[in-house]
């Protein structure tokens, strides 16, 4: 009779984390009599996964009834696979011996690789706002994926970025991996509505990349431009002067009128007009009673935006 | 010697579309000599998947070298699985015969089920806008998934909806399925910023549901409220009357001033103030020279919003 062979037909099996892995094993003969065991790894440090004879293996179920006399199928199913289960699994036939059973023949092994999805990428931006023409850094992080191969791209709006650096850790073999990428983005005045996108492709995502986003509105400060003009007189002895505060972001803005250097009125911008590009405009006006002035008056519109140093624009009102 | 057995250890195998399926099969003896074949299905109509002896099977590879004299492993791998590949696969041993080889023994069969992901759900809304308190319908469609079991939920913002009807087609067995759901949503004035979400859970999505969204801003029309008021006189013989147009959506708005029924001025709203709820406000004013009027004047603010029938509000200006 041909000597018993241990057949492990699959050289490798790839399973998604959380699923069950079926590891196939068949014997070609019932003899010599003796149990089978499954191990992960080979050599002295191998780990017992299943022992037909004794022990408690709550995650392992046998595909066939191993107590049946003529059973030749010793396939097992391991439930709730995690990346820590990756490795090469050996189906090993023992023959009965004394005092202990003796290893008789091993299957060729089945390599179990575990596909674990990356966590949702988290994109974080700079701690403080920057103004247009400056460069800011965004980071993208994701964890817990396997295998190690992963592709990461950065986009600003629809356009792919090239100025970024990516690391996948650890460098050596591991049950799962993490990715960390830093992109450098040059801000423009129109970036209030812009987004940066970190896009990750991995075998577990079946062609649907994961995306993490951050709004440049959190990272940008667009300082206002000021324009002070005199409106047509509406009544005798009254001058109407407006201060047009344009294209600023974010909203927070306080405006102070000064007449010849003395504070006349302070107001906080409330009802703003939003421009298409996401910046805001605001207009304030000052009615000046010319009767109260004999000489020309210098009117100053002073604006403090988003906690920054104040900027101002002045207008000389001629008293005729 | 024990008679040859054909061992197919796995009763069932589930594979994601696009992946390869390994179907395990082992013989327990080399005799009787003769080839093996793999079939899908049983009986007269079974489909040949692989013939060890002859034929060209580009999607099938054998796990072991079947030409080796002592090979007992007849497992195969089928590449690029699609839902059309679902079925029960039998590994069948033939013994040599004349004129044809004779079927000797079949394995118990392995049922291959194919997991195919649903396409991204497409949500579409009504063809014409409706006003608050009216009900509109949204549809959600997705195709190409397998198995048939699928769960679909509707949300408006974060709140689950209950008024919807869902069909999965076809009703009988199929290689893949489609879903079509219609949800009825009651509009409210605050719905400009609202979203409806169609959420689909399927075994292939590993707990990450697919979502399709539609913005209620595409489906809603919030008609404006009008208020006509007289402002304090700015100058002798001049009355300043304003028309406050509040809480309308979408933007498109044309305003006409009439003095005693005669068109005085028509303007199209441009710089609008956006409210927190996404609706818009706009104000128009009319300076009326009271010197030109001996009698009282009726001023009418007439607004045409989003191509709908005009609404108006009048104000009687007393000429003292």
């Amino acid at each position: 009779e041909d000597e018993l062979q241990v057949i492990q037909p699959e050289k490798s099996v790839s399973v998604a984390a959380g699923e069950s892995a079926t590891l196939c094993c068949a014997m070609t003969s019932l003899i010599p009599v003796g149990p089978i065991m499954w191990f992960r790894g080979a050599g002295a440090g191998r780990e017992l996964i299943y022992n037909q004879k004794e022990g408690h293996f709550p995650r392992v179920t046998t595909v066939s009834e191993l107590t049946k006399r003529n059973n030749l199928d010793f396939s097992i199913s391991i439930s709730n696979i995690t990346p820590a289960d990756a490795g090469t699994y050996y189906c090993v036939k023992f023959r009965k011996g004394s005092p202990d059973d003796v290893e008789f023949k091993s299957g060729a092994g089945t390599e179990l690789s575990v596909r674990a999805k990356p966590s949702a990428p988290v994109v974080s931006g700079p701690a403080v706002r920057a103004t247009p023409e400056h460069t800011v850094s965004f980071t993208c992080e994701s964890h817990g994926f396997s295998p190690r191969d992963i592709t990461l791209k950065w986009f600003k709006n629809g356009n792919e970025l090239s100025d970024f650096q990516t690391n996948v850790d650890p460098a050596g073999d591991s049950v799962s991996y993490s990715i960390h990428s830093t992109a450098r983005v040059v801000l423009t005045r129109g970036d209030v509505h812009s987004q940066v996108i970190c896009e990750m492709a991995h075998i577990t995502l079946q062609g649907d990349p994961l995306r993490g986003t951050a709004n440049l509105s959190e990272a940008i400060r667009v300082p206002p431009t000021l324009e002070v003009t005199q409106q047509p007189m509406r009544a005798e002895n009254q001058a109407n002067v407006t201060c047009q505060v344009s294209n600023f972001y974010p909203r927070g803005l306080q405006l102070t009128w000064l007449e010849n250097g003395n504070v006349s009125r302070t107001e906080t911008a409330s009802t703003l007009i939003e421009n298409k590009d996401g910046t805001y405009n605001w207009m304030s006006w000052l009615l000046v009673n010319t009767c109260a002035h004999r000489d020309d008056v210098v009117l100053t519109c002073q604006v403090e935006h988003d906690g920054q140093q104040a900027v101002s624009k002045s207008y000389a009102l001629e008293i005729s | 010697e024990d008679e040859l057995q054909v061992i197919q250890p796995e009763k069932s195998v589930s594979v994601a579309a696009g992946e390869s399926a390994t179907l395990c099969c082992a013989m327990t003896s080399l005799i009787p000599v003769g080839p093996i074949m793999w079939f899908r299905g049983a009986g007269a109509g079974r489909e040949l998947i692989y013939n060890q002896k002859e034929g060209h099977f580009p999607r099938v590879t054998t796990v072991s070298e079947l030409t080796k004299r002592n090979n007992l492993d007849f497992s195969i791998s089928i590449s690029n699985i699609t839902p059309a590949d679902a079925g029960t696969y039998y590994c069948v041993k033939f013994r040599k015969g004349s004129p044809d080889d004779v079927e000797f023994k079949s394995g118990a069969g392995t049922e291959l089920s194919v997991r195919a992901k649903p396409s991204a759900p497409v949500v579409s809304g009504p063809a014409v806008r409706a006003t608050p308190e009216h009900t509109v319908s949204f549809t959600c469609e997705s195709h190409g998934f397998s198995p048939r079991d699928i769960t679909l939920k509707w949300f408006k913002n974060g709140n689950e909806l209950s008024d919807f009807q869902t069909n999965v087609d076809p009703a009988g067995d199929s290689v893949s399925y489609s879903i079509h759901s219609t949800a009825r949503v009651v509009l409210t004035r605050g719905d400009v910023h609202s979203q409806v979400i169609c959420e689909m859970a399927h075994i292939t999505l590993q707990g990450d549901p697919l979502r399709g969204t539609a913005n209620l801003s595409e489906a809603i029309r919030v008609p404006p409220t009008l208020e006509v008021t007289q402002q304090p006189m700015r100058a002798e013989n001049q009355a300043n009357v304003t028309c406050q147009v509040s809480n309308f959506y979408p933007r498109g708005l044309q305003l006409t001033w009439l003095e005693n029924g005669n068109v005085s001025r028509t303007e199209t709203a441009s710089t609008l103030i956006e409210n927190k709820d996404g609706t818009y406000n706009w104000m128009s004013w009319l300076l009326v020279n009271t010197c030109a009027h001996r009698d009282d004047v009726v001023l009418t603010c007439q607004v045409e919003h989003d191509g709908q029938q005009a609404v108006s509000k009048s104000y009687a200006l007393e000429i003292s």
Epitope: V33, E54, T67, R69, K96, G97 | -
Partner: antibody
Framework: QVQLVQSGAEVKKPGASVKVSCKAS????????IVWVRQAPGQGLEWMGW????????NYAQKLQGRVTMTTDTSTSTAYMELRSLRSDDTAVYYC?????????????WGRGTLVTVSS | DIQMTQSPSSVSASVGDRVTITCRAS??????LAWYQQKPGKAPKLLIY???NLQSGVPSRFSGSGSGTDFTLTISSLQPEDFATYYC?????????FGGGTKVEIK
């Protein structure tokens, strides 16, 4: 035909030795172990020991240790059990049996038994 | 050593009766228990292996159950040829041990 054929009855004097044979046929001898079980008149079954026909490893009952030897001859597919220093309480029917369990020990094929009588 | 305690030591029954024999191990033996039938002057015959598996050729009126320490052999409808002595045997580890036997006699 799958069977175990044992040697004939023996009458021995106290202190003597006895060697019982068990010839296997109809199956692969080296694939299975052989056990020896004895049964004194009117008594139950007593396990004496086990031998691997594949490698010749043995395991004996503690009470018989030093008096019993089990051997196999794979060329003739025969197992042997020798018991030395016989006493009158060794009088029993001696059975050989094939053990067939994979992870456990059970005996699916038995010889007909050999009566060994120890008497002065 | 693992002691095997069988009860009852004898039972009187009629043809057609349901007969139950129990066997208790002094420590857990998983499912590694066998049952044998022995008739006078004959070798034992294996009925049940691994606690509940019917040996090939044995009538289906014989069944076994149990695991750990407590096991049962049931004859669902006693036949004339079933009058014999029945032994349990633990096969978990050396030394292998048998129960004391249960004699099934005609009432």
């Amino acid at each position: 035909q799958v069977q175990l054929v044992q040697s004939g009855a023996e009458v021995k004097k106290p202190g003597a030795s006895v060697k019982v044979s068990c010839k296997a046929s109809g199956y692969t001898f080296t694939g299975y172990g052989i056990v020896w079980v004895r049964q004194a008149p009117g008594q139950g079954l007593e396990w004496m020991g086990w031998i691997s026909a594949y490698a010749g490893e043995t395991n004996y009952a503690q009470k018989l240790q030093g008096r019993v030897t089990m051997t196999t001859d794979t060329s003739t597919s025969t197992a042997y059990m020798e018991l030395r220093s016989l006493r009158s309480d060794d009088t029993a029917v001696y059975y050989c049996a094939r053990e067939a369990g994979s992870s456990w020990y059970d005996f699916d094929l038995w010889g007909r038994g050999t009566l060994v009588t120890v008497s002065s | 050593d693992i002691q095997m305690t069988q009860s009852p030591s004898s039972v009187s029954a009629s043809v057609g009766d349901r007969v139950t024999i129990t066997c208790r191990a002094s420590q857990g033996i998983s499912s590694w228990l066998a049952w044998y039938q022995q008739k006078p002057g004959k070798a034992p015959k294996l009925l049940i292996y691994a606690a509940s598996n019917l040996q090939s050729g044995v009538p289906s009126r014989f069944s076994g159950s149990g695991s750990g320490t407590d096991f049962t052999l049931t004859i669902s409808s006693l036949q004339p040829e079933d009058f014999a002595t029945y032994y349990c045997q633990q096969g978990a580890s050396f030394p292998i041990t048998f129960g004391g036997g249960t004699k099934v006699e005609i009432k």
